[in-house]
């Protein structure tokens, strides 16, 4: 017996295109006398969807028989929903008036969202590879979803990233929406096995988000470290020099040995060993015939990795008339050298 209230229990309803939407409404009293009408939108431009009193509404049916006594259920069904039906629907009680009925009380409204699933997120990385300590950008795109509310997260190896910017377009009302996000990722030497994941959560996905991935192996370049080492003498007149090429990625690598600036041998990395972090190691060796040299010998290991400018390490062999004990040493810098008497 309380004054009539118009109750729309559902704040929002999600319906897939082609389905039937049920919009619920009950009135708590029969008084004041007057019809219930349904509108899409509010204000002067609202669109009449159903009028209990009069009119023809082919897509609309009432859930219950409004001619039955004590029936105060004014819920309606709208068939064959399309994205154009999205909006807020109001169940409005009118009071009989002359000449026109007067709006008495409105329900709080039910937002009808015509749901459409987002497309699988596509993650793209930079066009060129980058080295550790550099920041690279990844983009993630997904399209065709509705309603507009959507959540996008970025992960690197399961750890959520925070440095990203996301836009959902268009800003205004639309049949469907697109999301575009750009994340910044700082590369480390350990990122060969890393993955960047873009995760999109949407009401249509029922708690099972869509994921797009990018492997950092496609993005990262880890330049090699070189170590040139003189091995113990194999014979009176031979020295074995090795060039350890460590921790590089990708595998594409060409090594050239130079003796006093002249190309001695060129080879392409083939039988590499893989480290746990996904980088590679490779070793090349050069057997130098010391007796063929009267003067000191400058040995250079020159590596061209993944099309980048060559890096090199050198090692000096000193040829001497006075034999001393043999040993080994390592060239520390490309420009510096370590001398060793060989006899």
């Amino acid at each position: 017996e309380e004054e009539l209230q118009v109750i729309q229990p559902d704040k929002s309803v999600l319906v897939a295109a082609g389905e039937t939407a049920t919009l619920r409404c009950t009135a708590t009293s029969l008084i004041p006398v007057g019809p219930i009408q349904w509108f899409r939108g509010a204000g002067p431009g609202r669109e009449l969807i159903y009028n209990q009193k009069e009119g023809h509404f082919p897509r609309v049916t009432t859930v219950s028989d409004l001619t039955k006594r004590n029936n105060m259920d004014f819920s309606i069904r709208i068939g064959n929903i399309t994205p154009a039906d999205a909006g807020t629907y109001y169940c409005v009680k009118f009071r009989k008036g002359s000449p026109d009925d007067v709006e008495f009380k409105s329900g709080a409204g039910t937002e009808l969202s015509v749901r459409a699933k987002p497309s699988a997120p596509v993650v793209s990385g930079p066009a060129a590879r980058a080295t550790p300590q550099h920041t690279v950008s990844f983009t993630c795109e997904s399209h065709g979803f509705s309603p507009r509310d959507i959540t996008l997260k970025w992960f690197k190896n399961g750890n959520e990233l925070s440095d990203f910017q996301t836009n959902v377009d268009p800003v205004g009302e639309s049949v469907s929406y697109s999301i575009h996000s750009t994340a910044k990722v700082v590369l480390t030497r350990e990122d060969v096995h890393s993955q960047v994941i873009c995760e999109v959560a949407h009401v249509t996905l029922q708690g099972d988000p869509l994921r797009g991935t990018a492997n950092l192996s496609e993005t990262i370049r880890v330049p090699p470290t070189l170590e040139v080492t003189q091995q113990p003498v194999r014979a009176e007149n031979q020295v074995n020099v090795t060039c350890q090429v460590r921790k590089f990625y990708p595998q594409r690598l060409q090594l050239t040995w130079l003796e006093n600036g002249n190309v001695s041998r060129t080879e392409t990395a083939s039988t590499v060993t893989e480290n746990k972090d996904g980088t590679y190691n490779w070793m090349s060796w050069l057997l130098v015939n010391v007796s063929a040299h009267r003067d000191d010998v400058k040995l250079t290991c020159q590596v061209e990795h993944d099309g980048q400018p060559a890096v090199s390490k050198s090692h000096d062999l000193k040829v001497s008339a006075h034999p001393k004990e043999q040993g080994s040493n390592t060239a520390a810098e490309n420009t510096g050298s370590n001398e060793r008497n060989i006899y």
Epitope: E1, E2, E3, L4, S29, L30, I31, P32, V33, G34, P35, Q52, L66, T67, K68, R69, N71, R95, K96, G97, F104, K105
Partner: antibody, heavy 114, light 111 residues
């Protein structure tokens, strides 16, 4: 329990204004509409108007220009104001609650006389 | 305004007999499947009391001796059997249209 109680001046001089207060208890004015009805001595009932929970009003068109109904939810009071009273406005004035006038006050007698 | 005409204006019925009161509306008081006609009882010095609402629904606490019927413009209140306590004036009332209106009343006497 639900109670409505009218309080008025009793006697009003012709052409003067009438103010009646309906004080309610046992329910909230934010949930129920209040109607005003009057009954001249020995005669029938006449509906004057209603104030809905939101504060909007409807008046009997025959009296609309002379009537004003208002309320103060926090004080649980509804007010009837009527101006330019004549002798034929002498009546018992009732306030009543809700859609079917289920609950009534005992009424307050207003006599319009010089 | 909808005018409600009650007949008879007064009625004397013997104890235990049936009393029938008629109410005719100047236009239909039916809307959306309901008849917005109600019946009230008023005893001297008291406010009206709701007996029947929506033409035929018995108000809680009202004896089943009271019943209502009718639709559109013609309505009837029946008291069967009449008891001494039923002596009162009975009013029909409509709220299908504004302003709400009452019938002129029917005074019931018990013989």
């Amino acid at each position: 329990q639900v109670q409505l109680k009218e309080s008025g001046p009793g006697l009003v001089a012709p052409s003067q204004s009438l103010s009646i207060t309906c004080t309610v208890s046992g329910f909230s004015l934010s949930s129920y509409a209040i109607h005003w009805v009057r009954q001249p001595p020995g005669k029938g009932l006449e509906w004057l108007g209603v104030i809905w929970t939101g504060g909007s009003t409807i008046y009997n068109s025959a009296l609309m220009s002379r009537l004003n109904i208002s309320k103060d939810n926090s004080k649980s009071q509804v007010f009837l104001k009527m101006n330019s009273l004549q002798t034929d406005d002498t009546a018992m004035y009732y306030c009543a609650r809700g859609n079917y006038l289920r609950y009534w006050g005992q009424g307050t007698l207003v006599t319009v006389s010089a | 305004n909808i005018v409600l005409t009650q007949s008879p204006a007064s009625l004397a019925v013997s104890l235990g007999q049936r009393a029938t009161i008629s109410c005719r509306a100047s236009e239909s008081v039916d809307s959306y499947g309901y008849s917005y006609m109600h019946w009230n009882q008023q005893k001297p010095g008291q406010p009206p009391k709701l007996l029947i609402y929506l033409a035929s629904d018995l108000e809680s606490g009202v004896p089943a001796r009271f019943s209502g019927s009718g639709s559109r413009t013609d309505f009837t209140l029946t008291i069967d059997p009449v008891e001494a306590d039923d002596a009162a004036t009975y009013y029909c009332q409509q709220n299908n249209d504004d302003p709400w209106t009452f019938g002129g009343g029917t005074k019931l006497e018990i013989k």
